[in-house]
């Protein structure tokens, strides 16, 4: 899997898209999981609604939502008010039964808000990210 | 038991090469990168390089480019590091190091360290 | 590379004090920033990663905080297990980069 980066600035939502075939995936339920590290285990986040005929309704688990579109095949998940330590590394998975499968793997930077002054001189200005040559980014 | 247990010292030329040693046990060292980190009497800690036994893909850092080798053998559950043309500023203590990667490893583990003297 | 630059390089301090130690990067690194403590002849430990998060068994009398380029480790009340030096590492990109450490001595 390659990783996908999306980026958001701090204090504003940032929505993940994951996309999959939805007839492989029939029926399954979804998660969102932090990995702790590229190698880390995976903690479970958030995951879509116990009825997979419900998944379209949305759960939430603090600052993060979750909402599955089971006939477009799109997961889609929300982190709002976007904060530093919400960076890193996340899954988006497909379950069935105990196991999981990775539908994206998913890297999450949060850039500062450049309406914030405290920051003016130190602004960043992101780059293609160096640990991942191939890595697709969205905003 | 997890621990990282490294080859003993050595004391070389100039000119020549050393290969230091890092056996794991008490996990598998695929799911880990496996780093190394020097110390030169008295200094700071330098990065040298990562190896993922995985795929055995290494990075290292530019200044030692050329001149390192990060291996690791799956079968045995050991890494290498081999440093070549040997100069007495290469005297220090080598570590081995294994974490996640980048991005919040929770996970750290490092060997014993092994002293590599460079001398005439 | 992005360069560490620790501060103070070395301080005196009591059993008791509030010792602070700061790190800024040459670059935004977000919170990829980890804090280890290495006492003379052993390898490093890991007290700190992820900026603030406290490693598995290490003392809550130590912590961290910042984001962006500045970084803090404090530890609230030194014991005389705490005199050794400490170091900042970035783990954003590679090459990993250390700051040049920051020695606690008793004063």
């Known amino acids: 899997h390659n990783t996908t980066v999306f980026q958001g600035v701090e204090g504003q939502s940032l929505q993940v898209s994951c996309p999959y075939d939805s007839m492989k995936h029939w029926g399954r339920r979804k998660a969102w999981c932090r990995q702790l590290g590229e190698k880390g285990p995976c903690q479970r986040v958030v995951s879509t609604h116990n009825l997979w005929l419900l998944s379209f309704l949305r759960r939430r688990n603090g600052s993060t939502a979750i909402t599955d579109d089971t006939l477009g095949g799109t997961l889609t998940i929300t982190l709002r008010n976007l904060q530093p330590h919400d960076a890193g590394f996340y899954q988006c998975q497909s379950l069935h039964g105990s196991e999981a499968d990775t539908l994206r793997k998913v890297l999450v930077e949060v850039l500062a808000d450049p309406l914030d002054h405290r920051d003016a001189g130190d602004l960043w200005v992101p780059g293609e990210s160096e640990s991942f040559e191939d890595a697709h980014v969205e905003h | 038991q997890v621990q990282l247990v490294q080859s003993g010292a050595e004391v070389k030329k100039p000119g020549a090469s050393v290969k230091v040693s890092c056996k794991a046990s008490?996990?598998?060292?695929?799911?880990?990168?496996i780093h190394w980190v020097r110390q030169a009497p008295g200094q700071g800690l330098e990065w040298m390089g990562w190896?993922?036994?995985?795929?055995?893909?290494?990075k290292y850092a530019p200044k030692f480019q050329g001149r390192v080798t990060i291996t690791a053998d799956t079968s045995t559950s050991t890494a290498y590091m081999e440093l070549s043309s040997l100069r007495s500023e290469d005297t220090a203590v080598y570590y081995c190091h294994a974490d996640h990667g980048n991005y919040g490893s929770t996970m750290d583990y490092w060997g014993q360290g092994t002293l590599v003297t460079v001398s005439s | 590379d992005i360069q560490m630059t620790q501060s103070p390089s070395s301080l005196s301090a009591s059993v008791g004090d509030r010792v602070t130690i700061t790190c800024h990067a040459s670059q935004h690194i977000n919170v990829w920033l980890s804090w280890y403590q290495q006492k003379p002849g052993k390898a490093p430990k890991l007290l700190i990663y992820?900026?603030?998060n406290l490693h598995t068994g290490v003392p809550s009398r130590f912590s961290g905080s910042g984001s962006g380029t500045d970084f803090t480790l404090t530890i609230s009340s030194l014991q005389p297990e705490d005199f050794a030096t400490y170091y900042c590492q970035q783990g954003q990109t590679y090459p990993r980069t250390f700051g040049q450490g920051t020695k606690v001595e008793i004063k």
């Open positions: 992820k900026a603030s």
């Open positions: 008490g996990f598998s060292i695929e799911d880990f990168y």
């Open positions: 190896i993922d036994p995985e795929n055995g893909e290494s």
